[in-house]
Amino acid sequence: EPPTACREKQYLINSQCCSLCQPGQKLVSDCTEFTETECLPCGESEFLDTWNRETHCHQHKYCDPNLGLRVQQKGTSETDTICTCEEGWHCTSEACESCVLHRSCSPGFGVKQIATGVSDTICEPCPVGFFSNVSSAFEKCHPWTSCETKDLVVQQAGTNKTDVVCGPQDRLRA
């Protein structure tokens, strides 16, 4: 009786089970009662990453420098090229088809997590006792200066955007 289902790494065609082509190879011709499935390796800059019956290999992804992309991992006959973004940029999606400039954290905000090639900068508001007076993609919130440790007193209170201003203590005259 002709099979109705086939084993793993096989496919059903013309009432018989044929072997799938291994990753990195494409289908040239289906098996017959006399021959096995004929497969051919993918060409340069092509890949197939699964056991398959594809008649064409997929083209490797092109990391377009005009879109801020560069190659993170070169593709093989079994894997696609992995793109990432140039320094200072990050991917707009998981597929990393284009890049955008890393976001900077405005004054009053500090960097909680520095951006990578695939994720943007994460900013956080500077809490009480901390400030940031610059727009930066790297700077964290800095703690206010401790006037006391310098034997000074606070002359002007700090904010989330400014440091405290320290000054000398008023001395009582004799």
């Epitope: 011709s29 098996c31 009662e33 006399f34 021959t35 096995e36 004929e38």
Partner: antibody, heavy 117, light 107 residues
Framework: EVKLVESGGGLVKPGASLKLSCAAS????????MSWVRQNSDKRLEWVAS????????YYPDNVKGRCTISRENAKNTLYLEMSSLKTEDTALYYC??????????WGQGTSVTVST | DIVLTQSPATLSVIPGNSVSLSCRAS??????LHWYQQKSHESPRLLIN???QSISGIPSRFSGSGSGTDFTLTINSVETEDFGIYFC?????????FGGGTKLELK
């Protein structure tokens, strides 16, 4: 018991035609692909033709394409090989074989074809 | 066409000894290779399929190995009934092709 019995061989002149037959028994003939393979005096084996179980698909090497026709009559459990424009290099022992698991799992005893002036 | 080259052409052996017969393909055929044995005045018979799979009714002293382009048929402790010609055959692609054979003879 699987049995394949070839017949129809003989001595013919170059350019002549010949039809070989293979009577199959001991298995469900219509479930199997069949092939013809020949062996010359040097004992070299050469594939000549194959036909699918249903008879829809036929396969030939380039050197016999157009000169050989493989066919089958499933109702009669019989395989055929019709050869025309015979050449001296077609001289050989012709075997009928069954295709099982993509191998030639059973062979007949062969029928001799001699092409000579 | 895929060319199969068998070596040696002739192999002389003393019964009881083990032998290895080689079959080399002109391009990769994965494991799509069969081995056949032909004794004197007999038809060929299937010994091994898919390069290494044993066939029911064939003595266990016959074994096959290899993949890609290099294949080996090993006969452990040759018996007198093993003398004859051994052929490899590829079924990776059309046309089906056979090796030229290795003749195993008594030393």
């Amino acid at each position: 018991e699987v049995k394949l019995v070839e017949s129809g061989g003989g001595l013919v002149k170059p350019g002549a035609s010949l039809k070989l037959s293979c009577a199959a028994s001991g298995f469900t003939f219509s479930n199997y692909g069949m092939s013809w393979v020949r062996q010359n005096s040097d004992k070299r084996l050469e594939w000549v033709a194959s036909i699918s179980s249903g008879g829809d698909d036929t396969y030939y090497p380039d050197n016999v394409k157009g000169r050989c026709t493989i066919s089958r009559e499933n109702a009669k459990n019989t395989l055929y090989l019709e050869m025309s424009s015979l050449k001296t290099e077609d001289t050989a022992l012709y075997y009928c074989t069954r295709a099982g698991g993509k191998a030639m799992d059973y062979w007949g005893q062969g029928t001799s074809v001699t092409v000579s002036t | 066409d895929i060319v199969l080259t068998q070596s040696p052409a002739t192999l002389s052996v003393i019964p009881g000894n083990s032998v290895s017969l080689s079959c080399r393909a002109s391009q990769s055929i994965r494991d799509n290779l069969h081995w056949y044995q032909q004794k004197s005045h007999e038809s060929p018979r299937l010994l091994i399929n898919y390069a290494s799979q044993s066939i029911s009714g064939i003595p266990s002293r016959f074994s096959g190995s290899g993949s890609g382009t290099d294949f080996t048929l090993t006969i452990n402790s040759v018996e007198t009934e093993d003398f004859g010609i051994y052929f490899c055959q590829q079924f990776n692609s059309w046309p089906l092709t056979f090796g030229g054979g290795t003749k195993l003879e008594l030393k």
